[in-house]
Interface confidence: low
């Protein structure tokens, strides 16, 4: 199905408008903000989700930048330009003609410039580190149980193949999930690690993007895993280009 046939909704993206106007009266769903048709059997791209989110703006957030080559989404929300396949365009500009280059997850990777700024290619984010701090529990979670549960979550909920979950590290109360996906590894139909990470981030924050599903109730051997802090670091196949002023 393109979408749920009975009531014509998009199970993987509630920020859509759906109607039975597809071929043969099939349910077809379009993302808010962009009007682009989306495939409801898989995750919607982060670019289209951000664009939809900006059609009903909320407060931007700010995250901490950790190190030289790892990027964090410090700039918060913006209304992105997406290509016809729903990916971020390499160059993004705001209404005041300030432009910058982004990576495949839409995070700025250069200083801001003007309309003359060139972004030759969309640089792929091939390594994502999701840093979680869980709320105190009676004791530490069993590492292997936690590892299995998080791998299952990414496979089942986000349809990310287990081979892209490189590692799950745990030192109470910090959990780190490493997602790795090179350009050469990503086959047609594979969920992008950037999209999976974004869905996960929204789930963790209680802002699930899934239609009509309950929020994420993550448990390890029955014990709730309640996250109190999330940081996501992005590493690109080509290091970002910032001026020395920004790095000091």
């Amino acid at each position: 199905h393109t979408a749920a046939q009975d009531n014509c909704t998009c199970p993987t993206n509630k920020m859509t408008v759906c109607s039975p106007d597809g071929p043969g009266g099939r349910c077809q769903c379009r993302a808010l903000g962009s009007g682009m048709a989306v495939d409801c059997s898989t995750l919607t791209s982060k670019c289209l989700l951000l664009k939809a989110r900006m059609s009903a703006p909320k407060n931007a957030r700010t995250l901490v930048r950790p190190s030289e080559h790892a990027l964090v989404d410090n700039d918060g929300l913006y209304d992105p330009d997406c290509d016809p396949e729903g990916r971020f365009k390499a160059r993004q500009c705001n209404q005041t003609s300030v432009c910058w280059c982004v990576n495949s997850v839409g995070v700025r990777r250069t200083d801001k410039g003007d309309l003359s700024l060139r972004c030759d290619e969309l640089v792929r984010t091939h390594h994502i580190l999701i840093d979680l701090r869980h709320r105190p529990t009676a004791g530490a979670f069993n590492h292997s149980d936690l590892d299995a549960e998080l791998r299952r979550l990414f496979r089942e909920r986000y349809r990310l193949h287990p081979k892209f979950v490189a590692a799950v590290h745990y030192e109470q109360p910090t959990i780190q999930i490493e997602l790795r996906q090179n350009t050469s590894q990503k086959a047609a139909g594979d969920v992008d690690i950037g999209d999976a990470a974004y869905y996960f981030e929204r789930d963790i924050k209680g802002e699930s993007l899934f239609q009509g599903r309950g929020g994420l109730d993550l448990r390890v051997r029955g014990e709730p895993l309640q996250v109190e802090r999330t940081l996501i670091y992005y590493l690109d196949e080509i290091p970002p280009k910032f001026s020395m002023k920004r790095l000091t």
Partner: antibody, heavy 119, light 111 residues
Framework: QVQLQESGPGLVKPSETLSLTCTVS????????VHWIRQPPGKGLEWIGV???????DYNSALMGRVTISVDTSKNQFSLKLSSVTAADTAVYYC?????????????WGQGTLVTVSS | DIVMTQSPDSLAVSLGERATINCRAS??????????MHWYQQKPGQPPKLLIY???NLESGVPDRFSGSGSGTDFTLTISSLQAEDVAVYYC?????????FGQGTKLEIK
């Protein structure tokens, strides 16, 4: 409507390789994984393995080393190969589509094809 | 591997009466708010047909006399009012992890 159809030789000699094809019609095969399941005569169902949309495969460890699942997207076909067969591999073999996003199981099944292992 | 055990192996119920089939998993198949348990119906000479997914969700086109319940390790398939066309073998199956495994099947007949 998605349809799956298994095909292949109905008789295979012991120690040889069983080869089956699953042809999908009425939908894109690139959007879904495909599972293979078998059922010995008069018995229950056994999951053999799956090929995901990425082309990556997962197999039942009980058959590990003997089973290979592959895809030919140009022909809309999936294939199953099971080597070194014995009489215990006699079964109806089914291919089934990995279900839509929120089901996490197999929704559309082929009619199945009986494979007998005998000399 | 998770072992699925169904009970009873066979069941005879009068037309219009309630039929109940149980399935027990050797470890929990519920997590993250979902129960990865599914029920299939198989009639002679036919492939299995998905009836219930994720423990309690009715597959499209399946009559609403079928229902599923349970969580953790214990699950139940209920047919509220048995019809002649419900005679079949019923299987439970989990997708909590790989490999997926099935119960041994329950044969449902008319008394």
């Amino acid at each position: 409507q998605v349809q799956l159809q298994e095909s292949g030789p109905g008789l295979v000699k012991p120690s040889e390789t069983l080869s089956l094809t699953c042809t999908v019609s009425g939908g894109s095969i690139s959007s879904y994984g495909v599972h293979w399941i078998r059922q010995p005569p008069g018995k229950g169902l056994e999951w053999i393995g799956v090929i995901w949309t990425s082309g990556v495969t997962d197999y039942n460890s009980a058959l590990m080393g003997r089973v290979t699942i592959s895809v030919d997207t140009s022909k809309n076909q999936f294939s199953l190969k099971l080597s070194s067969v014995t009489a215990a591999d006699t079964a109806v073999y089914y291919c089934a589509r990995d279900a839509d996003y929120d089901r996490y199981t197999m929704d559309y099944w082929g009619q199945g094809t009986l494979v007998t292992v005998s000399s | 591997d998770i072992v699925m055990t169904q009970s009873p192996d066979s069941l005879a119920v009068s037309l219009g009466e309630r039929a109940t089939i149980n399935c027990r998993a050797s470890k929990s198949v519920s997590t993250s708010g979902y129960s990865y348990m599914h029920w299939y119906q198989q009639k002679p000479g036919q492939p299995p047909k998905l009836l219930i997914y994720l423990a309690s969700n009715l597959e499209s086109g399946v009559p609403d006399r079928f229902s599923g319940s349970g969580s953790g390790t214990d699950f139940t398939l209920t047919i509220s009012s048995l019809q002649a066309e419900d005679v079949a073998v019923y299987y439970c199956q989990h997708s909590r992890e790989l490999p997926y495994t099935f119960g041994q099947g329950t044969k449902l007949e008319i008394k």
